[in-house]
Protein backbone atom coordinates (compact mmCIF):
# COMPACT_ATOMS: atom_id res chain seq x y z
CA UNK A 1 0.00 0.00 0.00
CA UNK A 2 1.06 3.55 -0.71
CA UNK A 3 2.15 5.43 2.40
CA UNK A 4 0.00 8.40 3.46
CA UNK A 5 1.55 11.87 3.30
CA UNK A 6 0.05 15.32 3.12
CA UNK A 7 -0.06 17.03 -0.23
CA UNK A 8 2.31 19.99 -0.75
CA UNK A 9 0.18 23.07 -1.60
CA UNK A 10 1.91 23.56 -4.97
CA UNK A 11 1.04 19.98 -5.95
CA UNK A 12 -2.67 20.19 -5.27
CA UNK A 13 -4.69 18.64 -8.11
CA UNK A 14 -7.73 20.47 -9.46
CA UNK A 15 -8.10 18.50 -12.63
CA UNK A 16 -6.83 15.27 -14.12
CA UNK A 17 -4.27 16.23 -16.76
CA UNK A 18 -0.83 15.42 -18.18
CA UNK A 19 1.02 17.21 -15.39
CA UNK A 20 0.24 14.19 -13.19
CA UNK A 21 2.73 11.98 -15.02
CA UNK A 22 5.49 13.86 -13.17
CA UNK A 23 3.99 13.04 -9.76
CA UNK A 24 5.65 10.37 -7.67
CA UNK A 25 3.46 7.56 -6.36
CA UNK A 26 3.14 9.08 -2.89
CA UNK A 27 2.29 12.49 -4.36
CA UNK A 28 -0.48 11.00 -6.48
CA UNK A 29 -1.84 9.22 -3.44
CA UNK A 30 -1.78 12.38 -1.33
CA UNK A 31 -2.87 14.93 -3.91
CA UNK A 32 -5.47 13.27 -6.18
CA UNK A 33 -8.97 13.36 -4.77
CA UNK A 34 -10.75 10.07 -5.53
CA UNK A 35 -14.05 11.81 -6.28
CA UNK A 36 -12.31 14.13 -8.76
CA UNK A 37 -10.63 11.12 -10.37
CA UNK A 38 -13.98 9.34 -10.71
CA UNK A 39 -15.61 12.43 -12.21
CA UNK A 40 -12.83 12.87 -14.77
CA UNK A 41 -12.15 9.21 -15.61
CA UNK A 42 -12.65 9.95 -19.30
CA UNK A 43 -9.33 11.86 -19.27
CA UNK A 44 -7.21 9.15 -17.66
CA UNK A 45 -6.68 6.92 -20.68
CA UNK A 46 -5.25 9.76 -22.76
CA UNK A 47 -2.49 10.35 -20.19
CA UNK A 48 0.62 8.13 -20.42
CA UNK A 49 0.69 6.99 -16.80
CA UNK A 50 3.18 4.30 -15.79
CA UNK A 51 1.83 0.99 -14.50
CA UNK A 52 2.95 2.02 -11.01
CA UNK A 53 0.96 5.25 -11.25
CA UNK A 54 -2.08 3.31 -12.49
CA UNK A 55 -1.78 1.13 -9.39
CA UNK A 56 -2.18 4.26 -7.26
CA UNK A 57 -5.22 5.45 -9.24
CA UNK A 58 -6.83 2.01 -8.90
CA UNK A 59 -6.17 2.09 -5.16
CA UNK A 60 -7.96 5.44 -4.93
CA UNK A 61 -11.00 4.14 -6.83
CA UNK A 62 -11.06 0.98 -4.68
CA UNK A 63 -11.21 3.14 -1.54
CA UNK A 64 -13.97 5.33 -2.96
CA UNK A 65 -16.04 2.38 -4.21
CA UNK A 66 -15.39 -0.62 -1.92
CA UNK A 67 -18.62 -2.27 -3.15
CA UNK A 68 -17.60 -1.99 -6.80
CA UNK A 69 -17.25 0.82 -9.33
CA UNK A 70 -20.29 2.46 -10.91
CA UNK A 71 -20.72 2.02 -14.65
CA UNK A 72 -19.89 5.69 -15.31
CA UNK A 73 -16.37 4.91 -14.05
CA UNK A 74 -16.11 1.41 -15.59
CA UNK A 75 -16.90 2.75 -19.05
CA UNK A 76 -13.84 5.01 -18.99
CA UNK A 77 -11.33 2.68 -17.32
CA UNK A 78 -9.32 2.24 -20.51
CA UNK A 79 -5.90 0.77 -19.71
CA UNK A 80 -6.73 0.82 -16.02
CA UNK A 81 -8.90 -2.23 -16.84
CA UNK A 82 -5.66 -4.19 -17.26
CA UNK A 83 -5.09 -3.72 -13.52
CA UNK A 84 -8.41 -5.29 -12.55
CA UNK A 85 -8.69 -8.79 -11.13
CA UNK A 86 -11.70 -11.09 -11.62
CA UNK A 87 -12.54 -10.39 -7.95
CA UNK A 88 -12.72 -6.65 -8.67
CA UNK A 89 -14.92 -7.19 -11.73
CA UNK A 90 -17.27 -9.51 -9.87
CA UNK A 91 -18.44 -6.49 -7.83
CA UNK A 92 -19.54 -4.56 -10.90
CA UNK A 93 -22.98 -4.11 -12.42
CA UNK A 94 -22.61 -3.53 -16.16
CA UNK A 95 -25.52 -3.11 -18.57
CA UNK A 96 -24.08 -1.01 -21.39
CA UNK A 97 -22.68 -2.76 -24.45
CA UNK A 98 -20.59 0.34 -25.14
CA UNK A 99 -18.82 -0.34 -21.85
CA UNK A 100 -18.31 -3.98 -22.85
CA UNK A 101 -16.93 -2.99 -26.28
CA UNK A 102 -14.55 -0.43 -24.79
CA UNK A 103 -13.07 -2.92 -22.31
CA UNK A 104 -12.88 -5.78 -24.81
CA UNK A 105 -10.84 -3.51 -27.09
CA UNK A 106 -8.47 -2.63 -24.24
CA UNK A 107 -7.99 -6.29 -23.26
CA UNK A 108 -7.09 -7.40 -26.80
CA UNK A 109 -3.55 -8.78 -26.96
CA UNK A 110 -3.28 -9.09 -23.17
CA UNK A 111 -3.58 -12.28 -21.14
CA UNK A 112 -6.92 -11.42 -19.57
CA UNK A 113 -9.19 -14.36 -20.32
CA UNK A 114 -10.34 -14.67 -16.68
CA UNK A 115 -11.12 -10.96 -16.43
CA UNK A 116 -12.93 -10.90 -19.77
CA UNK A 117 -14.98 -13.97 -18.83
CA UNK A 118 -16.01 -12.32 -15.56
CA UNK A 119 -16.84 -9.06 -17.34
CA UNK A 120 -19.08 -10.85 -19.86
CA UNK A 121 -20.77 -12.69 -17.02
CA UNK A 122 -21.50 -9.37 -15.29
CA UNK A 123 -22.96 -7.94 -18.52
CA UNK A 124 -25.29 -10.92 -18.95
CA UNK A 125 -26.40 -10.62 -15.32
CA UNK A 126 -26.81 -6.86 -15.66
CA UNK A 127 -28.90 -7.13 -18.83
CA UNK A 128 -30.99 -10.00 -17.49
CA UNK A 129 -30.37 -12.32 -20.44
CA UNK A 130 -27.96 -13.04 -23.28
CA UNK A 131 -29.85 -11.03 -25.92
CA UNK A 132 -29.07 -10.59 -29.62
CA UNK A 133 -27.23 -7.29 -29.15
CA UNK A 134 -24.93 -8.87 -26.55
CA UNK A 135 -24.25 -11.90 -28.75
CA UNK A 136 -23.54 -9.60 -31.73
CA UNK A 137 -21.11 -7.58 -29.63
CA UNK A 138 -19.32 -10.70 -28.42
CA UNK A 139 -19.02 -12.22 -31.88
CA UNK A 140 -17.71 -8.94 -33.31
CA UNK A 141 -15.27 -7.96 -30.58
CA UNK A 142 -14.37 -11.23 -28.88
CA UNK A 143 -14.76 -14.35 -31.02
CA UNK A 144 -14.82 -17.41 -28.77
CA UNK A 145 -15.84 -15.41 -25.70
CA UNK A 146 -19.34 -16.86 -25.79
CA UNK A 147 -17.82 -20.10 -24.53
CA UNK A 148 -16.41 -18.36 -21.47
CA UNK A 149 -19.97 -18.21 -20.11
CA UNK A 150 -21.22 -20.91 -17.78
CA UNK A 151 -23.98 -23.28 -18.95
CA UNK A 152 -26.29 -21.51 -16.49
CA UNK A 153 -25.69 -18.14 -18.18
CA UNK A 154 -25.99 -19.65 -21.66
CA UNK A 155 -29.38 -21.03 -20.71
CA UNK A 156 -30.68 -17.45 -20.89
CA UNK A 157 -30.07 -17.30 -24.66
CA UNK A 158 -33.40 -17.16 -26.49
CA UNK A 159 -33.51 -19.58 -29.49
CA UNK A 160 -34.15 -16.59 -31.77
CA UNK A 161 -30.62 -15.34 -31.07
CA UNK A 162 -28.88 -18.59 -32.03
CA UNK A 163 -28.77 -17.61 -35.71
CA UNK A 164 -26.32 -14.83 -34.86
CA UNK A 165 -23.79 -17.35 -33.50
CA UNK A 166 -21.04 -18.33 -35.96
CA UNK A 167 -19.15 -21.66 -35.94
CA UNK A 168 -15.93 -20.00 -34.74
CA UNK A 169 -17.80 -18.56 -31.75
CA UNK A 170 -18.40 -22.11 -30.49
CA UNK A 171 -14.87 -23.37 -31.05
CA UNK A 172 -13.91 -23.36 -27.38
CA UNK A 173 -17.29 -24.47 -25.99
CA UNK A 174 -17.20 -27.59 -23.84
CA UNK A 175 -19.77 -30.42 -23.81
CA UNK A 176 -21.83 -28.89 -20.97
CA UNK A 177 -22.18 -25.62 -22.86
CA UNK A 178 -23.15 -27.37 -26.09
CA UNK A 179 -25.68 -29.46 -24.14
CA UNK A 180 -27.43 -26.17 -23.34
CA UNK A 181 -27.07 -24.58 -26.77
CA UNK A 182 -27.96 -27.58 -28.95
CA UNK A 183 -31.69 -27.81 -28.07
CA UNK A 184 -32.00 -24.06 -28.66
CA UNK A 185 -30.31 -24.40 -32.05
CA UNK A 186 -32.54 -27.33 -32.96
CA UNK A 187 -35.57 -25.19 -32.19
CA UNK A 188 -34.17 -22.16 -34.02
CA UNK A 189 -33.44 -24.08 -37.24
CA UNK A 190 -36.36 -26.54 -37.17
CA UNK A 191 -38.10 -25.06 -40.22
CA UNK A 192 -35.07 -25.36 -42.51
CA UNK A 193 -34.66 -28.00 -45.21
CA UNK A 194 -32.31 -30.99 -44.72
CA UNK A 195 -29.04 -29.71 -46.16
CA UNK A 196 -29.53 -26.12 -44.94
CA UNK A 197 -30.47 -27.44 -41.50
CA UNK A 198 -27.31 -29.57 -41.30
CA UNK A 199 -25.04 -26.63 -42.20
CA UNK A 200 -26.63 -24.54 -39.45
CA UNK A 201 -26.83 -27.21 -36.75
CA UNK A 202 -23.37 -28.67 -37.36
CA UNK A 203 -21.42 -26.39 -34.94
CA UNK A 204 -23.87 -27.30 -32.16
CA UNK A 205 -23.86 -31.08 -32.65
CA UNK A 206 -21.49 -31.65 -29.73
CA UNK A 207 -24.65 -31.43 -27.62
CA UNK A 208 -26.81 -33.77 -29.73
CA UNK A 209 -28.32 -36.97 -28.28
CA UNK A 210 -28.06 -40.35 -30.04
CA UNK A 211 -31.55 -40.23 -31.52
CA UNK A 212 -30.79 -36.96 -33.31
CA UNK A 213 -27.50 -38.32 -34.65
CA UNK A 214 -29.33 -41.45 -35.87
CA UNK A 215 -31.90 -39.24 -37.57
CA UNK A 216 -29.11 -37.33 -39.35
CA UNK A 217 -27.70 -40.62 -40.64
CA UNK A 218 -30.90 -41.06 -42.65
CA UNK A 219 -30.51 -37.69 -44.38
CA UNK A 220 -27.40 -38.11 -46.58
CA UNK A 221 -25.56 -35.33 -44.76
CA UNK A 222 -22.01 -36.68 -45.33
CA UNK A 223 -20.75 -35.53 -41.95
CA UNK A 224 -17.02 -34.80 -41.92
CA UNK A 225 -14.78 -36.36 -39.27
CA UNK A 226 -14.08 -33.00 -37.64
CA UNK A 227 -17.79 -32.85 -36.76
CA UNK A 228 -18.08 -36.55 -35.93
CA UNK A 229 -15.14 -36.34 -33.50
CA UNK A 230 -16.92 -33.55 -31.62
CA UNK A 231 -20.06 -35.63 -30.98
CA UNK A 232 -20.65 -36.79 -27.44
CA UNK A 233 -19.16 -40.21 -26.79
CA UNK A 234 -22.54 -41.32 -25.40
CA UNK A 235 -24.22 -40.25 -28.64
CA UNK A 236 -21.77 -42.19 -30.83
CA UNK A 237 -21.50 -45.51 -28.95
CA UNK A 238 -25.02 -46.81 -29.74
CA UNK A 239 -24.64 -46.18 -33.50
CA UNK A 240 -24.39 -49.26 -35.72
CA UNK A 241 -21.72 -49.63 -38.40
CA UNK A 242 -24.39 -49.11 -41.06
CA UNK A 243 -25.57 -45.89 -39.39
CA UNK A 244 -22.05 -44.51 -39.13
CA UNK A 245 -21.40 -45.40 -42.76
CA UNK A 246 -24.57 -43.56 -43.84
CA UNK A 247 -23.82 -40.63 -41.54
CA UNK A 248 -20.27 -40.09 -42.82
CA UNK A 249 -20.83 -41.06 -46.45
CA UNK A 250 -17.55 -40.63 -48.37
CA UNK A 251 -15.85 -39.39 -45.18
CA UNK A 252 -16.13 -42.85 -43.61
CA UNK A 253 -12.52 -43.49 -44.71
CA UNK A 254 -11.46 -40.97 -42.07
CA UNK A 255 -12.31 -43.47 -39.34
CA UNK A 256 -9.03 -45.22 -40.14
CA UNK A 257 -6.80 -42.29 -39.24
CA UNK A 258 -8.83 -41.59 -36.09
CA UNK A 259 -9.14 -45.22 -34.94
CA UNK A 260 -7.05 -44.61 -31.81
CA UNK A 261 -8.89 -41.45 -30.76
CA UNK A 262 -12.09 -41.18 -28.75
CA UNK A 263 -14.94 -41.45 -29.66
CA UNK A 264 -13.93 -43.58 -32.68
CA UNK A 265 -11.84 -45.97 -30.57
CA UNK A 266 -14.65 -46.51 -28.05
CA UNK A 267 -17.17 -47.03 -30.85
CA UNK A 268 -14.92 -49.61 -32.61
CA UNK A 269 -14.64 -51.62 -29.38
CA UNK A 270 -18.45 -51.96 -29.26
CA UNK A 271 -18.90 -53.17 -32.86
CA UNK A 272 -18.70 -56.71 -34.19
CA UNK A 273 -15.44 -57.20 -36.09
CA UNK A 274 -17.48 -58.73 -38.94
CA UNK A 275 -19.44 -55.49 -39.30
CA UNK A 276 -16.30 -53.35 -39.16
CA UNK A 277 -14.74 -55.47 -41.88
CA UNK A 278 -17.58 -54.53 -44.24
CA UNK A 279 -16.16 -50.98 -44.30
CA UNK A 280 -12.93 -52.27 -45.86
CA UNK A 281 -10.80 -49.84 -43.84
CA UNK A 282 -8.79 -52.34 -41.83
CA UNK A 283 -10.31 -51.19 -38.54
CA UNK A 284 -9.29 -53.54 -35.72
CA UNK A 285 -10.48 -54.06 -32.17
CA UNK A 286 -14.10 -55.06 -32.67
CA UNK A 287 -15.85 -57.93 -30.91
CA UNK A 288 -14.67 -61.21 -32.46
CA UNK A 289 -17.04 -63.60 -34.24
CA UNK A 290 -19.04 -65.96 -32.08
CA UNK A 291 -18.70 -63.89 -28.92
CA UNK A 292 -21.86 -63.22 -26.94
CA UNK A 293 -22.26 -59.67 -25.62
CA UNK A 294 -23.77 -59.42 -22.14
CA UNK A 295 -24.80 -55.94 -21.07
CA UNK A 296 -24.20 -56.25 -17.32
CA UNK A 297 -25.35 -52.71 -16.66
CA UNK A 298 -28.88 -53.72 -17.71
CA UNK A 299 -28.82 -56.78 -15.42
CA UNK A 300 -27.64 -54.64 -12.50
CA UNK A 301 -30.41 -52.16 -13.14
CA UNK A 302 -33.01 -54.96 -13.03
CA UNK A 303 -31.74 -56.60 -9.84
Amino acid sequence: DVERTTCPPEKEVHEIDESLIFYKKRELEACVDAALLAAQMDRVDAIPFTYEQLDVLKHKLDELYPQGYPESVIRHLGHLFLKMSPEDIRKWNVTSLETLKALLKVSKGHEMSAQVATLIDRVVVGRGQLDKDTVDTLTAFCPGCLCSLSPERLSSVPPSVIGAVRPQDLDTCGPRQLDVLYPKARLAFQNMSGSEYFVKIRPFLGGAPTEDVKALSQQNVSMDLATFMKLRREAVLPLTVAEVQKLLGPHVEGLKVEEQHSPVRDWILKQRQDDLDTLGLGLQGGIPNGYLILDLSVREALS
Epitope: D171, L225, A226, M229, H261, G282
Partner: antibody, heavy 119, light 108 residues
Framework: DVQLQQSGPELVEPGASVRIPCKAA????????VDWVKQSHGQSLEWIGD????????IYNQKFEGKATLTVDTSSSTAYMELRSLTSEDTAVYFC????????????WGQGTTLTVSS | QVVLTQSPAIMSASPGEKVTLTCGAS???????LYWYQQKPGSSPKLWIY???NLASGVPARFSGSGSGTSYSLTISSMEAEDAASYFC?????????FGGGTKVEIK
Protein backbone atom coordinates in the same frame (compact mmCIF):
# COMPACT_ATOMS: atom_id res chain seq x y z
CA ASP B 1 -3.25 -17.47 -43.32
CA VAL B 2 -2.65 -20.64 -41.30
CA GLN B 3 0.15 -20.40 -38.78
CA LEU B 4 1.66 -22.66 -36.17
CA GLN B 5 3.99 -20.60 -34.02
CA GLN B 6 6.58 -22.35 -31.86
CA SER B 7 8.89 -20.93 -29.21
CA GLY B 8 12.58 -20.18 -29.73
CA PRO B 9 15.59 -22.44 -29.07
CA GLU B 10 15.97 -24.08 -25.66
CA LEU B 11 19.18 -25.02 -23.87
CA VAL B 12 18.53 -27.26 -20.88
CA GLU B 13 20.54 -29.44 -18.54
CA PRO B 14 20.32 -33.24 -18.48
CA GLY B 15 17.57 -34.52 -16.20
CA ALA B 16 15.47 -31.38 -16.57
CA SER B 17 12.11 -30.96 -18.32
CA VAL B 18 11.00 -28.57 -21.03
CA ARG B 19 7.58 -27.48 -22.30
CA ILE B 20 7.29 -26.39 -25.93
CA PRO B 21 4.22 -24.40 -27.03
CA CYS B 22 2.65 -24.40 -30.47
CA LYS B 23 0.12 -21.60 -31.00
CA ALA B 24 -2.32 -22.00 -33.86
CA ALA B 25 -3.94 -19.19 -35.81
CA UNK B 26 -5.94 -18.91 -39.01
CA UNK B 27 -8.02 -22.08 -38.67
CA UNK B 28 -10.65 -23.66 -36.44
CA UNK B 29 -8.44 -25.16 -33.76
CA UNK B 30 -10.79 -28.00 -32.86
CA UNK B 31 -11.02 -29.23 -36.47
CA UNK B 32 -7.40 -30.39 -36.40
CA UNK B 33 -5.26 -32.74 -34.37
CA VAL B 34 -1.84 -31.41 -33.42
CA ASP B 35 0.99 -33.85 -34.11
CA TRP B 36 4.58 -33.58 -32.92
CA VAL B 37 7.62 -34.73 -34.89
CA LYS B 38 11.28 -35.04 -33.87
CA GLN B 39 14.19 -34.44 -36.25
CA SER B 40 17.66 -35.27 -34.96
CA HIS B 41 20.61 -33.42 -36.53
CA GLY B 42 18.96 -32.84 -39.89
CA GLN B 43 18.28 -36.54 -40.37
CA SER B 44 14.97 -38.33 -40.60
CA LEU B 45 11.68 -37.52 -38.96
CA GLU B 46 10.12 -39.41 -36.06
CA TRP B 47 6.46 -39.15 -35.16
CA ILE B 48 6.07 -38.57 -31.41
CA GLY B 49 2.29 -38.53 -31.11
CA ASP B 50 -0.82 -36.48 -31.62
CA UNK B 51 -3.43 -34.79 -29.48
CA UNK B 52 -7.10 -34.17 -30.20
CA UNK B 53 -8.20 -30.70 -29.03
CA UNK B 54 -11.80 -31.83 -28.53
CA UNK B 55 -11.02 -34.50 -25.96
CA UNK B 56 -7.47 -33.55 -24.93
CA UNK B 57 -6.78 -37.22 -25.68
CA UNK B 58 -3.25 -37.98 -26.84
CA ILE B 59 -1.81 -40.96 -28.68
CA TYR B 60 1.90 -41.68 -28.50
CA ASN B 61 4.49 -43.53 -30.47
CA GLN B 62 5.48 -46.21 -27.93
CA LYS B 63 9.08 -45.03 -28.18
CA PHE B 64 8.07 -41.68 -26.63
CA GLU B 65 5.67 -42.99 -23.94
CA GLY B 66 6.88 -41.58 -20.64
CA LYS B 67 9.17 -39.12 -22.40
CA ALA B 68 6.60 -36.80 -23.99
CA THR B 69 3.27 -35.49 -22.70
CA LEU B 70 0.98 -33.75 -25.19
CA THR B 71 -1.75 -31.37 -24.08
CA VAL B 72 -3.89 -28.58 -25.52
CA ASP B 73 -5.48 -25.39 -24.27
CA THR B 74 -8.40 -24.65 -26.58
CA SER B 75 -9.05 -21.24 -25.00
CA SER B 76 -5.72 -20.00 -26.36
CA SER B 77 -5.56 -22.36 -29.40
CA THR B 78 -2.23 -23.65 -28.11
CA ALA B 79 -0.82 -27.17 -28.00
CA TYR B 80 2.04 -28.11 -25.70
CA MET B 81 4.61 -30.86 -25.62
CA GLU B 82 6.44 -31.51 -22.37
CA LEU B 83 9.62 -33.58 -22.53
CA ARG B 84 11.04 -34.90 -19.26
CA SER B 85 14.17 -36.59 -17.90
CA LEU B 86 16.12 -35.07 -20.76
CA THR B 87 19.33 -36.60 -22.05
CA SER B 88 21.65 -35.75 -24.93
CA GLU B 89 19.56 -38.17 -27.06
CA ASP B 90 16.72 -35.66 -26.88
CA THR B 91 18.79 -32.95 -28.58
CA ALA B 92 16.85 -32.30 -31.79
CA VAL B 93 14.48 -29.99 -33.61
CA TYR B 94 10.86 -30.56 -32.59
CA PHE B 95 8.06 -29.63 -34.97
CA CYS B 96 4.35 -29.34 -34.35
CA UNK B 97 2.10 -29.96 -37.34
CA UNK B 98 -1.62 -29.90 -37.90
CA UNK B 99 -3.69 -32.74 -39.32
CA UNK B 100 -7.33 -32.27 -40.20
CA UNK B 101 -9.54 -34.69 -38.31
CA UNK B 102 -10.27 -37.70 -40.47
CA UNK B 103 -7.44 -36.99 -42.86
CA UNK B 104 -3.83 -38.12 -42.98
CA UNK B 105 -0.73 -36.06 -43.52
CA UNK B 106 0.33 -32.75 -42.10
CA UNK B 107 -0.67 -29.79 -44.24
CA UNK B 108 0.92 -27.11 -42.09
CA TRP B 109 3.98 -27.18 -39.81
CA GLY B 110 5.45 -24.96 -37.11
CA GLN B 111 8.89 -23.50 -37.72
CA GLY B 112 10.44 -25.96 -35.26
CA THR B 113 11.98 -25.53 -31.81
CA THR B 114 15.63 -26.48 -31.40
CA LEU B 115 16.26 -28.26 -28.11
CA THR B 116 19.84 -28.71 -26.91
CA VAL B 117 20.44 -30.87 -23.84
CA SER B 118 23.85 -30.16 -22.40
CA SER B 119 25.51 -29.51 -19.07
CA GLN C 1 5.67 -50.84 -36.99
CA VAL C 2 5.91 -50.17 -40.73
CA VAL C 3 9.50 -49.41 -41.75
CA LEU C 4 9.92 -47.16 -44.78
CA THR C 5 13.22 -47.45 -46.66
CA GLN C 6 14.17 -44.69 -49.08
CA SER C 7 16.79 -44.89 -51.78
CA PRO C 8 19.11 -43.48 -52.72
CA ALA C 9 20.10 -41.59 -49.56
CA ILE C 10 21.78 -38.83 -51.59
CA MET C 11 21.74 -38.12 -55.29
CA SER C 12 22.85 -35.40 -57.71
CA ALA C 13 20.99 -34.44 -60.86
CA SER C 14 21.64 -31.98 -63.65
CA PRO C 15 19.01 -29.38 -64.60
CA GLY C 16 16.50 -30.96 -67.00
CA GLU C 17 17.32 -34.51 -65.90
CA LYS C 18 14.58 -36.97 -64.83
CA VAL C 19 14.83 -37.96 -61.15
CA THR C 20 13.15 -40.92 -59.45
CA LEU C 21 13.14 -41.49 -55.69
CA THR C 22 11.84 -44.73 -54.20
CA CYS C 23 10.20 -45.64 -50.92
CA GLY C 24 9.77 -49.28 -49.89
CA ALA C 25 7.47 -50.39 -47.06
CA SER C 26 8.10 -53.37 -44.80
CA UNK C 27 4.43 -54.37 -45.16
CA UNK C 28 1.74 -53.56 -47.69
CA UNK C 29 0.07 -50.13 -47.42
CA UNK C 30 -3.20 -48.78 -48.71
CA UNK C 31 -1.97 -46.24 -51.27
CA UNK C 32 -4.24 -43.52 -49.85
CA UNK C 33 -2.08 -43.58 -46.73
CA LEU C 34 1.29 -42.79 -48.36
CA TYR C 35 2.48 -39.16 -48.41
CA TRP C 36 5.66 -37.28 -49.42
CA TYR C 37 7.18 -34.14 -47.87
CA GLN C 38 9.84 -31.77 -49.16
CA GLN C 39 12.25 -30.11 -46.72
CA LYS C 40 14.90 -27.50 -47.43
CA PRO C 41 17.75 -26.75 -44.98
CA GLY C 42 16.65 -24.62 -42.03
CA SER C 43 12.95 -24.96 -42.92
CA SER C 44 10.01 -27.09 -41.87
CA PRO C 45 8.85 -29.96 -44.06
CA LYS C 46 6.11 -29.14 -46.58
CA LEU C 47 3.37 -31.49 -47.72
CA TRP C 48 4.31 -32.35 -51.32
CA ILE C 49 2.32 -35.38 -52.46
CA TYR C 50 -0.65 -36.98 -50.73
CA UNK C 51 -2.41 -40.31 -51.24
CA UNK C 52 0.52 -41.61 -53.33
CA UNK C 53 -0.14 -39.53 -56.44
CA ASN C 54 -1.93 -36.25 -55.66
CA LEU C 55 0.13 -33.05 -55.72
CA ALA C 56 -0.33 -30.68 -52.78
CA SER C 57 -1.34 -27.11 -53.49
CA GLY C 58 1.42 -25.10 -55.21
CA VAL C 59 3.55 -28.11 -56.19
CA PRO C 60 4.82 -27.87 -59.79
CA ALA C 61 3.37 -30.31 -62.34
CA ARG C 62 6.83 -31.76 -63.08
CA PHE C 63 6.42 -33.76 -59.87
CA SER C 64 4.45 -36.98 -59.83
CA GLY C 65 3.94 -39.90 -57.47
CA SER C 66 2.98 -43.51 -58.01
CA GLY C 67 3.01 -46.93 -56.42
CA SER C 68 1.00 -49.53 -54.54
CA GLY C 69 1.47 -52.28 -51.97
CA THR C 70 5.02 -52.00 -50.66
CA SER C 71 6.63 -49.97 -53.45
CA TYR C 72 6.24 -46.22 -54.03
CA SER C 73 8.08 -43.54 -55.96
CA LEU C 74 8.32 -39.78 -56.46
CA THR C 75 9.44 -38.55 -59.88
CA ILE C 76 10.68 -35.15 -61.07
CA SER C 77 10.29 -35.16 -64.85
CA SER C 78 12.79 -32.35 -65.41
CA MET C 79 15.04 -31.32 -62.50
CA GLU C 80 15.22 -27.62 -61.63
CA ALA C 81 17.48 -25.83 -59.14
CA GLU C 82 14.59 -25.07 -56.77
CA ASP C 83 13.87 -28.82 -56.45
CA ALA C 84 17.14 -29.37 -54.55
CA ALA C 85 15.93 -30.53 -51.12
CA SER C 86 15.35 -33.59 -48.97
CA TYR C 87 12.26 -35.69 -49.66
CA PHE C 88 10.64 -37.91 -47.02
CA CYS C 89 7.94 -40.52 -47.56
CA UNK C 90 5.43 -40.99 -44.72
CA UNK C 91 2.74 -43.56 -43.94
CA UNK C 92 -0.30 -43.32 -41.73
CA UNK C 93 -1.67 -46.76 -42.60
CA UNK C 94 -0.92 -47.98 -39.09
CA UNK C 95 0.31 -46.67 -35.75
CA UNK C 96 2.88 -45.45 -35.09
CA UNK C 97 3.06 -43.22 -38.14
CA UNK C 98 6.51 -43.54 -39.70
CA PHE C 99 8.76 -41.65 -42.11
CA GLY C 100 11.41 -42.88 -44.47
CA GLY C 101 15.05 -41.92 -43.88
CA GLY C 102 14.85 -39.31 -46.63
CA THR C 103 16.56 -38.74 -49.96
CA LYS C 104 18.69 -35.64 -50.38
CA VAL C 105 18.53 -34.36 -53.96
CA GLU C 106 21.32 -32.02 -55.01
CA ILE C 107 21.74 -30.05 -58.22
CA LYS C 108 24.88 -30.62 -60.28
Amino acid sequence: DVQLQQSGPELVEPGASVRIPCKAAGHTFTDYNVDWVKQSHGQSLEWIGDVNPNTDGAIYNQKFEGKATLTVDTSSSTAYMELRSLTSEDTAVYFCARRRLGQGGFDSWGQGTTLTVSS
Amino acid sequence: QVVLTQSPAIMSASPGEKVTLTCGASSSLISKYLYWYQQKPGSSPKLWIYSTSNLASGVPARFSGSGSGTSYSLTISSMEAEDAASYFCHQWSSYPYTFGGGTKVEIK
